[in-house]
């Protein structure tokens, strides 16, 4: 029979979807026990049918990877979890709908920092997400967001920054004494969609000057 | 070295249709933010519409919405613009151009596209 | 969507006079902000990106600066082939806008 609240068994069903990696999770209610088991279903807006997820079914695990099922970035998304205890009470609960574009939250760039001897060269590697082109190759978030920026930033000293920021992937502060450690960070921001990363860090030493020694 | 040539411009009633393509070379055509921009006579650039060659994602003008359809043929190196619904506000030299390394930075040469009664 | 107000809208130079072009952003684009060079009967070409940064193959007499959401192009010493039309674009989000643009004469 079915508890009074699905919440005894079941609470927080949510997907946490990150550079487009699409994890649904939950927890166990207060009446949750650890042979509870959990099966999976997912669909599309505007569907009617429920898919059962092969390999989310009676499972005792509160995660399901639904990055495949979920990878179309133009559609809306549902998904629900059944839990069934030992004593055979069971309970279900649904998701909001989701958007991968817009609920995912994105992971610090990948960066390469060169130093010189009065610049710190910054390359921004594209970050792979784990979606497919018709052509097979994984696209990056650079192909999905047409407006995605690079924000750089060098820590000079404790009162002063320098920037730089753009599309490109290549960029270098110039005008910086030699022989010098600076701090960079790197975020991708994208402002359509008010998405902003974690940054990535760099701790650099510019290169000692060798032509006056 | 690269090149974008546009063609398929020319006069059409309003109302009709016309399809503008662009042929590109000298980069990696399938992996590319591909746009179409015009000019009126005598006017100042508006983008019109943009496309991902990889992903397929595409954007377009408030005022143009509706009306045409951005796509490509990735094995032919081919951009296209399908205009519907034509407007003689429409009357325009169409350009097309692409992102390389961060910058809109290389351009074709332009076709007239103008719509008249 | 971010409007780009440009001005002036036309200016006449002599040779060798300093000139500048401003574009004032109605919201923040950072420093996602391009100038263009665009000749009759052409298309536009690149001068300056992400604000202050020149295009390689474009004399140093062009220079970019941003103060806010406030942009400038600067040409140092204008020369006859500067007659044109300059255009700043802002790149920093769907529609991309340019501003209305600057028809520069040579006296």
């Known amino acids: 029979h079915a508890p009074e609240d699905p919440s005894d068994l079941l609470q927080h069903v949510k997907f946490q979807s990150s550079n487009f990696e699409n994890i649904l999770t939950w927890d166990s209610g207060p009446e949750g026990t650890p042979d509870t088991v959990y099966s999976i279903e997912y669909k599309t807006y505007g569907e009617r049918d429920w898919v059962a997820k092969k390999g989310c079914q009676r499972i005792t695990r509160k995660s399901c990877n639904l990055t495949v099922e979920t990878g179309n970035l133009t559609e809306l998304y549902y998904a629900r979890v059944t839990a069934v205890s030992a004593g055979g009470r069971s309970a279900t609960k649904m998701t909001d709908r989701f958007s991968s574009l817009q609920h995912t939250t994105l992971k610090p760039p990948d960066v390469t920092c060169i130093s010189k001897v009065r610049s710190i060269q910054m390359i921004v590697h594209p970050t792979p997400t784990p979606i497919r082109a018709g052509d097979g190759h994984r696209l990056t978030l650079e192909d999905i967001f047409h407006d995605l920026f690079y924000h750089l930033e060098l820590q000079v000293n404790r009162t002063y920054q320098m920037h730089l920021g753009g599309k490109q992937r290549e960029y270098e502060f110039f005008g910086l004494t030699p022989d010098t450690e600076f701090l960079g960070t790197i975020m991708i921001c994208v402002p359509t969609w008010a998405k902003e990363s974690a940054p990535y860090m760099c701790r650099v030493k510019t290169l000692p000057d060798r032509t006056w020694t | 070295e690269v090149q974008l040539v546009e063609s398929g411009g020319g006069l059409v009633q309003p109302g009709g249709s016309l399809r503008l393509s662009c042929a590109a070379s000298g980069f990696t055509f399938s992996s590319s933010w591909m746009y179409w921009v015009r000019q009126a006579p005598g006017k100042g650039l508006e983008f019109v519409s943009v496309i991902n060659t990889r992903s397929g994602i595409t954007h377009y003008v408030e005022s143009v919405k509706g009306r045409f359809t951005i796509s490509t043929d990735n094995a032919k190196n081919t951009l296209f613009l399908q205009m519907n619904s034509l407007k003689s506000e429409d009357t325009a030299v169409y350009y097309c151009?692409?992102?390389?390394?961060?910058?809109?930075?290389?351009w074709g040469q332009g076709t007239q596209v103008t719509v008249s009664s | 969507d971010i409007v780009m107000t440009q001005s002036p809208s036309s200016l006449s130079a002599s040779l060798g006079d300093r000139v500048t072009v401003t574009c004032q952003a109605s919201q923040s684009i950072r420093s996602s902000l391009n100038w263009y060079q665009q000749k009759p009967g052409q298309a536009p070409k690149l001068l300056i990106y992400?604000?202050?940064r020149l295009r390689i193959g474009v004399p140093s007499r062009f220079s970019g600066s941003a103060s806010g959401t406030s942009f400038t192009l600067t040409i140092s010493g204008v020369e006859s082939e500067d007659l044109a039309t300059y255009y700043c674009l802002q790149d920093y989000t769907w529609p991309l806008s340019f501003g209305s643009g600057t028809r520069l004469e040579i006296k």
């Open positions: 992400g604000a202050s």
């Open positions: 151009a692409t992102r390389i390394q961060g910058l809109i930075d290389y």
